[in-house]
Interface confidence: medium
């Protein structure tokens, strides 16, 4: 969370950004809020990126002004125009690229004053894991698969019954490059699984942490997955 103050004569406004992460190939949002101003025509929003000449996006007089937009962002950006008057200056970024990572500045000018705040935007790939029984293995085994990760994550297994146990000796993890030659499919197999236990497959890189759980008993099988972005908010 970054809060910036701007001073215009005696006037300043608070601008707030949130460090966020983009999933490459998908759409992302760079979050920015400011003190609302009912006078839409008096609001100017500028998004800038460190090291890039020209603007990422500009919104003024109630509409987009892309005359100074850098070519790498052409056709890929939009603000939430209907939410600008309530103080939302967040930027929608289409088809996130690895090169979109960096430091962005959200600059706001309204009739009340002006202000800005920076945000760190990380890019990578992250996806939910799914755990299933592996029928190709010779022993009772679980297979954890997640289709898209970048950078290469670490994978760890845990179990409710054997808390603190090191499963690295009884698991095998592989990374398979996807067709776009950036992201990778993660596959991890855990061997010698026993029933009446809950197993967790944890996949983590510096952008996200994902966990897949499978509850294994002889009378039910239940799954749960969750994904958490790191260092955000």
């Amino acid at each position: 969370l970054i809060i910036g103050f701007g001073i215009s004569g005696k006037h300043f406004i608070t601008v707030t950004t949130f460090t966020s992460a983009g999933n490459i190939g998908e759409d992302g949002t760079l979050s920015c809020t400011f003190e609302p101003d009912i006078k839409l025509n008096g609001i100017v929003i500028q998004w800038l990126k460190e090291g890039i000449k020209g603007l990422v996006h500009e919104f003024k007089e109630g509409k987009d002004d892309l005359s100074q937009q850098h070519e790498m962002f052409r056709g890929r950006t939009a603000v939430f125009a209907d939410q600008v008057v309530v103080g939302n200056a967040s930027l929608r970024l289409k088809n996130v690229q690895l090169t979109d990572a960096g430091t962005y500045t959200c600059y706001i000018r309204t009739s009340k004053g002006k202000g800005n705040a920076n945000l760190e935007y990380k890019t990578g790939a992250f996806s939910m894991p799914e755990i299933n029984v592996d029928y190709n293995a010779s022993s009772e085994s679980l297979r954890c698969e997640a289709p898209r990760w970048f950078p290469q994550p670490t994978v760890a297994w845990a179990s409710q019954v054997d808390q603190g146990a090191n499963f690295s000796e009884v698991s095998n993890t592989s990374f398979e490059l996807n067709s776009e030659n950036v992201t990778m499919k993660v596959v991890s197999v855990l061997y010698n699984v026993t029933i009446n236990n809950t197993y967790s497959c944890m996949i983590e890189n510096d952008i996200a942490k994902a966990t897949g759980d499978i509850k294994v008993t002889d009378s039910e099988v239940k799954r749960r997955s969750q994904l958490q972005l790191l260092n955000s908010g």
Epitope: Y135, V216, D218, S219
Partner: antibody, heavy 119, light 108 residues
């Protein structure tokens, strides 16, 4: 070899009760979850209930919940299905089947016992 | 609850011909699918588990394929003893375990 033998089927009036038994042999009964699966005449297979290896967990199909009770006696290697408030729609061949391990399909079935609910 | 749908309901095939049976899940079940054969007056018999692995003692003419929501059981060359009803069953998430409605393979 694994053997499952059901018994206790017969003709019963609607609203009455019946108890089915399944005698197991050829495997360590107390180590495996056990299921009941039924098949109405000329119809498909319907899973009915499961009980965990130690009897601590039971699950039922919505169609029998609150009326049927699955139980087991590990000292006798026997599975039971207590069927109460029987309806015409419960008429079926009832099979017991062995679950187990991480593999929740049925490699072993009994020969089935027919339950007919009719007035 | 995961709903399993089998098609066709009846398949007429001549002995020696190939039979292809389909099974569709209402949501992804990965490879957690079994196929059973049932002859009149008998209990079902497990043919395939894990969508494609033959159970012990099942002839090589039976093969399973598919993953996610679409599955197929293929009998490469039908023998007289293969005319029966075939059921698919999902065990991805349960209870409840659910079966398809069945496909009857009859002599053409």
């Amino acid at each position: 070899q694994v053997q499952l033998v059901e018994s206790g089927g017969g003709v019963v009036q609607p609203g009455r009760s019946l108890r089915l038994s399944c005698a197991a042999s050829g495997f360590t009964f107390r180590s495996f979850g056990m299921h009941w699966v039924r098949q109405a005449p000329g119809k498909g297979l319907e899973w009915v209930a499961v009980i965990s290896y130690d009897g601590s967990n039971e699950y039922y199909a919505d169609s029998v919940k609150g009326r049927f009770i699955i139980s087991r006696d590990n000292s006798k290697d026997t599975l039971y299905l207590q069927m109460n408030s029987l309806r015409a729609g419960d008429t079926a061949v009832y099979y017991c089947a062995k679950g187990g391990g991480l593999r929740w399909y049925f490699a072993y079935w009994g020969q089935g016992t027919l339950v007919t609910v009719s007035s | 609850e995961i709903v399993m749908t089998q098609s066709p309901a009846t398949l007429s095939v001549s002995p020696g011909e190939r039979a292809t049976l389909s099974c569709r899940a209402s949501q992804s079940i990965s490879s957690n699918l079994g196929w059973y054969q049932q002859k009149p007056g008998q209990a079902p018999r497990l043919l395939i588990y894990g969508a494609s692995t033959r159970a012990t003692g099942i002839p090589a003419r039976f093969s399973g394929s598919g993953s996610g929501t679409e599955f197929t059981l293929t009998i490469s060359s039908l023998q007289s003893e293969d005319f029966a009803v075939y059921y698919c069953q999902q065990y991805n998430s349960w209870p409840p375990l659910t079966f398809g409605g069945g496909t009857k393979v009859e002599i053409k």
